[in-house]
């Protein structure tokens, strides 16, 4: 005789709203095996029994959570196999607050995961990330759990909130932090992530004074044309392949400023470009370390900057100045950013 359950796992996680079939079958040398599911809640799925097999269909409702047992018998011999079914809900519904962070302020950031099940601190974890690393020095405040207001009865989904007090984001501040929420289930790990952009000063590498009327730039790592009027490089994952950077920067209206483009394919070359009319020139005025150690090419409204020998850009601030007018654009390049190798 052979007794089989498919899928064979003793624990199965099912996303809410999705269906799953668990087939239990048995072959019998002398006659037909009798196979049936027991330990079923009246609402736990539906069973279709055939000669020698029984199919349990789970509809992906929270009420489907349970541990049914398949029992197979052949003559005097019997076998059984239990399956722990866990129905979970983990939609990509993260909400962060505030919408952006201001460097130089002691502040609390919160991250809420909506419509979650199970609402178990042991299965759901929150992390505040800088690049791919946990933000050192952030202090986790107490988590909160509240039941969501449901339109339909019988679906007790929850929202879970984690708050952190932020350490000083440093000078210069990073372009963004990320809230990462991970749900750990039997043989399944799910993760969602939400960006929390950091406001950046447009005109100075110093951290912004919160009382100043300086315009700010809101940097975002969403992909768009690689044109910048300020800080716009986000930390890349530490493991290849590295995505090509193509950030978008949202800025307040202001004077015509030079724009900085990055070309990762060219071994980290930066191009500063002015398009504010004729007679405008641009030049690089600031780079990490000594500006003289970089390779510069300046041609009127365009100025290039690259590292010699070719390699990753040094972490820190790059500044390009436009004349006449003296408007500057600052770009922050974080550390450990390695360009794609040319192929």
């Amino acid at each position: 005789q052979s007794f089989q359950v498919n899928p064979p796992e003793s624990e199965v996680a099912v996303a809410m709203g999705t269906s799953l079939q668990i087939t239990c079958s048995m072959s019998c040398d002398e006659g037909v095996a009798r196979v049936h599911w027991r330990g079923l809640d009246t609402s736990l799925g539906s069973v279709q029994t055939l000669p020698g097999s029984s199919i349990l269909s789970v509809r992906g409702m929270l009420s489907d959570t349970g541990t049914p047992v398949c029992v197979g018998s052949c003559g005097s011999r019997s076998f059984q196999h239990s399956v722990k079914i866990l129905v979970y809900a983990f939609p990509d519904q993260l909400v962060v607050s505030p919408e952006f962070l201001v460097p130089g302020q002691d502040q609390v950031v919160s991250c809420t995961a909506h419509n979650i099940w199970p609402a178990d601190p042991n299965s759901l974890s929150f992390a505040l990330l800088l690049g791919e690393q946990r933000l050192e020095g952030a202090q986790a405040l107490e988590p909160e759990q509240e039941e969501e207001i449901q339109e339909a009865e019988g679906t007790p989904l929850f929202r879970m909130t984690q708050r952190w007090r932020l350490p000083s984001l440093g000078t210069p501040a990073p372009p963004a932090l990320h809230c990462q929420v991970t749900m750990q289930l039997p043989k399944l790990v799910l993760t969602h992530r939400k960006e929390i952009p950091v406001l950046q000063s447009q005109t100075s590498p110093k951290p912004p004074n919160t009382t100043s009327a300086e315009p700010y730039i809101l940097t975002s790592s969403s992909t768009a044309e690689a044109v910048s009027t300020g800080l716009n490089i986000t930390t890349l994952p530490s493991a290849p392949p590295y995505p090509k950077l193509s950030p978008r920067t949202l800025s307040s209206e202001g004077p015509c400023r030079p724009k900085i483009h990055q070309d990762l394919e060219a071994g980290w070359e930066l191009l500063c470009e002015a398009s504010c009319g004729p007679g405008v020139t641009v030049r690089w005025t600031l780079a990490p370390g000594d500006l003289a150690t970089y390779h510069k090419r300046e041609a009127g409204a365009q100025a290039w900057l690259s590292v010699l020998p070719p390699g990753p850009m040094v972490e820190g601030w790059f500044q390009c100045r436009q004349d006449p007018g003296g408007e500057v654009t600052n770009l922050y390049v974080p550390g450990q950013v390695t360009p794609n190798s040319s192929s």
């Epitope: 202090q139 986790a140 107490e142 007090r165």
Partner: antibody, heavy 119, light 107 residues
């Protein structure tokens, strides 16, 4: 000089109430989160509650949740702890402590005030 | 909650001795750990923060080390005024928690 000075302790019967105060001086009080920490006789330190500088965030140890309320009056540079439904196990020296922004350790402590809950 | 366990709970030492107190967290607290000194009838006094940074005004014979779950407070040469109880505290997440204390007594 940065100073914290607690007051309001005393002897109270079980089920009774008491309000502790902590007067701060020598620093911009509203810029700092503040804590209450207690120490039962012969025992170790136990964190009780915190409050943020603008009173927007508060939290309590499970042992006092629903019975104690932390508050502050930034115009008076004073921190408060309203203690209701007091129990014998709340007997302790209560300290107020200042929280260091960006690092979150308690860098300045008051001298403490003694609360005795006994019939 | 994160549990903090100090060892030993008490120790006897002489003036001039090198004293080491350990503190273990039940889960990683990174470097979010402070050490306090408390004398009888007095308030705790901050010695070390961020695991190894010496608080202003604290003698340099005090030092801290460690990260993650295992931390150490060292007094390089014990002085008469150092006889006291020492507490570690994690402030990585709430509720903040203290070790049970280590009493340093005169031998």
């Amino acid at each position: 000089e940065v100073q914290l000075l607690e007051s309001g302790g005393g002897l109270v019967q079980p089920g009774g109430s008491l309000r502790l105060s902590c007067a701060a001086s020598g620093f911009t009080f509203s810029d700092f989160w503040m804590h209450w920490v207690r120490q039962a006789p012969g025992k170790g330190l136990e964190w009780v509650s915190y409050i943020s500088g603008d009173s927007g965030y508060t939290n309590y140890a499970d042992s006092v949740k629903g019975r104690f309320t932390i508050s502050r009056d930034n115009s008076k540079n004073t921190l408060y702890l309203q203690m209701n439904s007091l129990r014998a196990e709340d007997t302790a020296v209560y300290y107020c402590a200042r929280d260091r922004p960006y690092y979150y350790y308690m860098d300045v402590w008051g001298k403490g005030t003694t609360v005795t809950v006994s019939s | 909650d994160i549990q903090m366990t100090q060892s030993p709970s008490s120790l006897s030492a002489s003036v001039g001795d090198r004293v080491t107190i350990t503190c273990r967290a039940s889960q990683s607290v990174s470097r979010s750990l402070a050490w306090y000194q408390q004398k009888p009838g007095k308030a705790p006094k901050l010695l070390i923060y961020a695991a190894s940074s010496l608080q202003s005004g604290v003698p340099s014979r005090f030092s801290g080390s460690g990260s993650g779950t295992d931390f150490t407070l060292t007094i390089s040469s014990l002085q008469p005024e150092d006889f006291a109880t020492y507490y570690c505290q994690q402030y990585k997440s709430y509720p903040v928690t203290f070790g049970q204390g280590t009493k340093v007594e005169i031998k």
